[in-house]
Interface confidence: medium
């Protein structure tokens, strides 16, 4: 065909408001003199003696020029119909990336401006080399590789199996029939890490302790448990109708609140972050509610945590998880055994 098909539906050609446009008669050979009409308008727009062959030149198009055009040869052979659609070339898309665990990340994008035209996105990434490692630049191990687009969620691609300490360059190119525009974004996984909120938050009263609540939770399902990549947590609580949250940083997957207001329901929420402070805190978990026990008062055990710390009787074995309750900076941290009171005391001391 003499008319190169721009990306988009067949029979459609594209232009930009305020600019000249050249339409191409699809059904004739290149250079064949043709007459042009606006579909539904019988007047001749451009005759075969224009010297433009099978092309129609519109000097400066605007929205009224959108629509269908008819072309035909000198002897009346119909060259077909062309629909003119106006829009804008892509602007640089806006791209952001986020990770909910330490080995996968996703990038999302939005158009820099609305083009009004059919649009697709080309997404890829490569591992950036360290300064001086020039020999690696074209190495297959550095990419580029496609960033697979999520079939269920438009405008999102996911990189699996990323290296936590490496830097990656993300390329998102917006393509429409009038051109392409690229955004390059350099990301480090440890900078964009934001875990999902902790799950399974439960708040229970502690029988016989009217100022205590026991909160427990689990790691988010999206966080693959490994000894070197642990989470730390932040817990907030407040009595009903109270405007301000109290905040504590628990050790492990539970916390005993010792200064609850007797008889009042309390909202509790919890957030997570990489234990070495990579990235940012997660969003807060959905609030869970609990009301302290109203049973007979028990003698308090001395509070070694200034009113917020874990209490011996409140520590329960973490049956659901092999991960340590307390992050360790040792190369090979071993889980603490909550069932061993001596070990627990040692930790609290």
């Amino acid at each position: 065909s003499p008319c190169p098909q721009a990306w988009g539906p067949p029979g459609v050609q594209y232009g930009q408001p305020g600019r000249p446009v050249m339409l191409c008669c699809p059904g004739v050979s290149a250079g064949t003199p043709v007459s042009w009409f606006r579909d539904g308008d019988s007047r001749l727009l451009q005759g075969p003696d224009s010297g433009l062959g099978h092309r129609l030149v519109l000097a400066q198009v605007d929205s009224p020029d959108e629509g269908t055009y008819v072309c035909q040869t000198l002897d009346g052979v119909s060259g077909g119909m062309v629909t003119l659609k106006l829009g804008f070339p892509p602007a640089r898309p806006e791209v952001s990336c986020q990770a909910v665990d330490y080995e996968n990340f996703s990038c999302t994008w939005s158009p820099g401006q609305v083009s009004g035209l059919p649009t697709r996105y080309l997404t890829s990434y490569r591992k950036k080399t360290l300064p001086g490692a020039e020999s690696q630049r074209e190495s297959p191990s550095t990419g580029p590789w496609p960033c697979p687009q999520d079939p269920l969620e438009a405008s999102r691609c996911v990189v699996h199996g990323a290296e936590f300490w490496s830097e990656y360059r993300i390329n998102v190119t917006e393509v429409n029939p009038l051109g392409a525009s690229t955004c390059l974004l350099d990301v480090r996984l440890q900078s964009i890490l934001r875990p999902d909120p902790p799950q399974g938050l439960r708040v229970e009263s502690v029988p016989g302790y009217p100022r205590r609540l026991h909160a427990s939770w689990t790691y988010p399902a999206s966080w693959r448990r490994q000894p070197h990549f642990l989470l730390k947590f932040r817990l907030q609580y407040r009595p009903a109708q109270h405007p301000a949250w109290s905040t504590v940083e628990p050790i492990g997957l539970e916390e005993v609140i010792t200064d609850a207001v007797a008889g009042l329901p309390h909202a509790v929420r919890v957030s997570a972050r990489d234990f070495l402070d990579a990235g940012t805190w997660s969003a807060w978990s959905p609030e869970a509610w609990g009301t302290p026990s109203t049973g007979p008062l028990q003698d308090e055990i001395p509070d070694w945590s200034q009113g917020h710390g874990q209490q011996l009787e409140a520590v329960v074995a973490q049956e659901d998880s092999p991960a340590p309750a307390r992050p360790s900076l040792q190369p090979d941290p071993r889980p603490l055994d909550h069932r061993d009171p001596l070990e627990q005391v040692a930790v609290l001391a």
């Epitope: 009409f37 539904g40 308008d41 001749l44």
Partner: antibody, heavy 117, light 107 residues
């Protein structure tokens, strides 16, 4: 050579319908617009509408929008015009004409339609 | 609709004479005007398109001119077979319309 064959005459009753045919030969049927025209002695020539045989796209004279329906059968290279609710005003010679978008280059010999009880 | 008015309604001339037929449009139609010839009991045939463009197979004695609202069809020297009815047609806007015709008859 280009030929457009039309029946010579049709005698029809008032209130009925008639479907006029125009069989094309000598050229690629789907490459050209087919027009239909009406001619009466006093009123002269009137354009009814046209049809693009490749995709059956039509344009009608609003005056005939409710009177005429244009169709094509690509397999037999035949164009049709159905006229409905006929009255004496519809008595005329009807031509099919091969053309471009707005011109009439080759004409059939015409069908004389007489509406009479 | 655009109305085309042809004059004269009838023109009586002899073979060999020059002839000029007129067609006037009710509004400016640029050069979107065409001329047809129709002989008795025959279908019309296209003579001139877009006011002045000749048609393959049509004798050179036929010529057209004009633009806007006033158009003419001229014969440099009438032949016997030229005596017929002539129609103008506009394609400036839908619906396509015709003049009422000028009858060119032998004097």
């Amino acid at each position: 050579q280009v030929q457009l064959q039309q029946p010579g005459a049709e005698l029809v009753r008032p209130g009925s319908s008639v479907k006029l045919s125009c069989k094309a030969s000598g050229y690629t049927f789907t490459n050209y617009w087919m027009h239909w025209l009406k001619q009466r002695p006093v009123q002269g020539l009137e354009w009814i509408g046209n049809i693009g045989p490749s995709d059956s796209k039509t344009h009608y004279n609003q005056k005939f929008k409710d009177k005429a329906t244009l169709t094509v059968d690509k397999s037999s290279s035949t164009a049709y015009m159905q006229l409905n609710s006929l009255t004496s005003e519809d008595s005329a010679v009807y031509y099919c004409a091969r053309g471009d978008y707005v011109l009439f280059t080759y004409w059939g010999q015409g069908t004389l339609v007489t509406v009479s009880a | 609709d655009i109305v085309l008015t042809q004059s004269p309604a009838t023109l009586s001339l002899s073979p060999g004479e020059r002839a000029t037929l007129s067609c006037r449009a009710s509004q400016s139609i640029s050069n979107n005007l065409h001329w047809y010839q129709q002989k008795s009991h025959e279908a019309p045939r296209l003579l001139i398109k877009y006011a002045s463009q000749s048609i393959s197979g049509i004798p050179a004695r036929f010529s057209g001119s004009g633009s806007g609202t006033d158009f003419t069809l001229s014969f440099s020297s009438l032949e016997t077979e030229d005596f017929a009815v002539y129609f103008c047609q506009q394609s400036y806007s839908w619906p396509l319309t015709f003049g009422q015709g000028t009858k060119l008859e032998i004097k």
